[in-house]
Interface confidence: medium
């Protein structure tokens, strides 16, 4: 579709005559109409096969034709085409005398013809408009034209149809061949699809519109490239949404389990080496001088009580030195200048001579000790608690309190943690050390089974090591039912399971 | 053609008959204008049909369709709320520019959801 | 959304000079297009397009209309203006989907 454009510009008939020979009067009234068609090698009459126009009277005689004349007609002239300009034409350009207001060809005089003109030729498209000038024995005209494509149509025929949008169809303006030209931030065929952010996942996020980065589920961060990791996921990480691969140190199904105590709480004081002795325990070695459970306490060499016999101990840079009561003497009192008439015994002990009567022994009552019985009797200093429990002296006996786990008169018992039933929606619940494991059924999550779990999150196989993937609702969680010897959430840890599991 | 009084939450469809220009050449499109809210677009149909695109507070309510055999635009409206209150205008999109910036307008509808 | 701000109306005196203007919340140049169209309503008809890409008359809009500007401002001149102008008159954005359109100027005489 276009437009075949003719510009009028300048009519000289100077005598004011028609092709005739006879003279108008007063002088001749000029219109033209103009015929436009195919190629032909001869122009020779027959339709107008591209179309005709005619104008109003655009003057008498001689006169020049300006731009959008003030007769009412259209200057340039438009002769409109809805077919492939074929790149060839033929014109006709004829001047008329009309002498009254009636200009159709049947109200005219048959000699009202001023001049006629023809001429064809090849026309290619395009803006430049072509200047002609035809003469004859007594006029001359001098017109241009030119052949433009309508609104919207393109190429060197006028053939190509492009409507620039900007809408939900496209985001597109034309280029002079017609082709599409992407507004900023589309592509496509039709320029319909966003450019999302620069660097946004392929896979992972989205556009709706350029420059953005949606994230699909499971995913997360500016570019969508960072998983979401399972849901209350605490020392852990993900490869793939939903995970939970727990940190080095961690474990369960959580990695909320903390298996190196040390590293995490470094609980250890003054230079003691931690070692790790279980889930949430540990043991310090102590450096000479220190002593404590976080080997926390500055070791006194009084502390020992290495002065017997009531004598006291005086702490020094290099050591300690005994300062012995009357009738004692030795590094550590341990020598006695006492007899039976002496009463050395103390808290209610028992005089015995030895030695026909140089020396004695004191037999002590119960809860005292010591050659005099000076001391009360620590219950606690054989260590008595086990599995870390504290001793406490509670006068004449002694009691251990126990760390969480443990019960007995020596802590020695392990508590039962599943006695309480623990595990959720049917789950079977094991003792570990310290602490309980529950195994889910099928469609529950958790450390006691208490999350449901979503059915397309086992879609991408995300068990290990032969485990069982069940899911549920929300359609966004799995778990994994771990095989002998395998834990976490994936199943991914190989573990020496106690043998007291039931298994 | 179709407007007039309806009840909230019933239905009712609007017509709009195209002529003057090649309707199956042309995307779509209603708009509609109340006193309050002024002039909202509404929906669009692309020109063969197959793509279709809704204002958020209609979308799943409001259904766009044509019969290009019979140059024809509809609006099927369900669940229809008070705040719908409108006088309905069917028109060519204007994604697809008509040659020398012509456009087609329907005359309007005017539809009321009252109870 | 874009949206589209016009002061609610404006006072005119026959044969002289009308300025309406529209102001977007965000540019509606694209790639040197302006994306604005400008509508006429009169009372009880359909809206009328008179200007579009800001700066083009549509077919049969005489030439006393006339559109200019570009980014967010965009301005609709009636020069002069004639008594069959007192209408309403919205502009509208097709920069981005959904299309917004103004809140309208009414034209009222002085």
């Known amino acids: 579709s276009g437009v075949f454009q003719l510009q009028l510009q300048e009519f000289a008939n100077e005598r004011g005559v028609l092709a005739s020979g006879r003279r108008c009067e007063p002088g001749c009234r000029t219109f033209f109409r103009v015929c436009l068609k195919h190629f032909q090698a001869v122009v020779s009459p027959g339709p107008c096969t591209f179309g005709s126009v005619s104008t109003p009277v655009l003057g008498t005689n001689s006169f020049a034709v300006g731009d959008d004349s003030s007769g009412g007609g259209r200057n340039p002239l438009q002769l409109p085409f809805n077919f492939t300009w074929p790149g060839t034409f033929s014109l006709i350009i004829e001047a008329w005398h009309a002498p009254g207001d009636d200009l159709r060809p049947e109200a005219l005089p048959p000699d009202a013809l001023i001049s006629k003109i023809a001429i064809q030729g090849s026309l290619p498209v395009g803006q430049k408009w072509l200047l002609d000038e035809q003469t004859s024995p007594l006029t001359r005209l001098r017109y241009s034209y030119r052949v433009i494509c309508s609104d919207n149509y393109y190429g060197d025929s006028c053939s190509r149809l492009c409507k620039k949008r900007n809408d939900h169809f496209g985001h597109y303006v034309c280029q002079p061949d017609g082709s599409l030209s992407c507004l900023p931030g589309w592509t496509g065929e039709y320029c319909e699809q966003p450019v999302c952010l620069s660097g946004c996942h392929e896979q992972n996020g989205y556009c709706s519109k350029p420059a953005e980065c949606i994230c699909r589920p499971g995913w997360q961060g500016r570019l969508c490239n960072e998983c979401i990791p399972h849901n209350g996921c605490r020392h852990g990480t993900c490869s793939t949404p939903w995970q939970c691969t727990c940190d080095e140190g961690w474990g369960g199904l959580f990695c909320d389990q903390d298996l190196n105590y040390c590293t995490h709480h470094s609980p250890c004081k003054n230079g003691a080496t931690c070692s790790n002795s279980g889930q949430r325990s540990y043991t310090c070695t102590c450096r000479p001088g220190y002593t404590g459970v976080d080997c926390e306490l500055e070791l006194s060499e009084c502390d020992s009580n290495p002065c017997r016999n009531g004598g006291s101990c005086k702490d020094q840079e290099d050591g300690y030195r005994c300062l012995c009561p009357p009738g004692y003497y030795g590094l550590h009192c341990e020598h006695s200048t006492l007899t039976c008439a002496d009463s050395p015994c103390f808290n209610g002990g028992s005089c015995q001579e030895r030695n026909q009567g140089a020396s004695y022994a004191c037999e002590c009552p119960p809860n005292f000790t010591g050659s005099n019985c000076e001391k009360k009797v620590d219950r606690c200093t054989s260590n008595p608690c086990a599995n870390g429990g504290q001793c406490l002296n509670r006068g004449p006996n002694r009691v251990c309190r126990c760390r969480p786990g443990f019960t007995g008169a020596h802590c020695e018992l392990h508590i039962s943690d599943c006695a309480r039933s623990p595990c959720a929606h049917g789950g079977t619940c094991h003792d570990l050390e310290t602490g309980f494991v529950c195994t889910c059924p099928a469609g529950f999550s958790g450390r006691r089974c208490e999350v449901r779990i979503p059915t397309e999150a086992c879609a991408s196989g995300p068990c290990l090591n032969g485990a069982t993937c069940y899911t549920g609702l929300p359609p966004d969680n799995f778990v994994c039912n771990c095989p002998y010897g395998f834990v976490g959430s994936r199943c991914e840890f190989p573990v020496s399971m106690p043998p007291s599991f039931p298994w | 053609s179709g407007g007039g009084l309806v009840q909230p939450g019933r239905s009712m469809k609007l017509s709009c008959a195209a002529s003057g220009f090649t309707f199956s050449n042309y995307d779509m499109a209603w708009v509609r204008q109340d006193p309050k809210k002024g002039l909202e677009w509404v929906a669009t149909?692309?020109?063969?049909?197959?793509?279709?695109y809704y204002r958020d507070s209609v979308k799943g309510r409001f259904t766009i369709s044509r019969d290009n055999a019979k140059s024809t635009l509809y609006l099927q409206m369900d669940s229809l709320r008070s705040e719908d209150t409108a006088t309905y205008y069917c028109?060519?999109?204007?994604?697809?520019?008509?040659?020398?910036?012509?456009?087609?307008w329907g005359q309007g509808i005017s539809v009321t959801v009252s109870s | 959304d874009i949206v589209l701000t016009q002061s609610p109306a404006l006072a005119v005196t026959l044969g002289q000079r009308a300025t309406i203007s529209c102001r977007a919340s965000q540019s509606v140049t694209i790639s040197n297009y302006n994306l604005m169209q400008w509508y006429q309503q009169r009372p009880g008809r359909q809206p009328k397009l008179l200007i579009y890409d800001a700066s083009n008359l549509a077919s049969g809009i005489p030439a006393r209309f006339s559109g200019s500007g570009s980014g967010t401002d965009f301005t609709l001149t009636i020069d002069p203006v004639q008594a069959d102008d007192i209408a309403t008159y919205y502009c509208q954005q097709s920069r981005d989907d959904p299309r917004t359109f103004g809140g309208g100027t009414k034209l009222e005489l002085r």
């Open positions: 149909i692309s020109y063969d049909g197959r793509s279709t």
């Open positions: 028109k060519d999109y204007d994604g697809h520019y008509h040659p020398y910036g012509m456009e087609a």
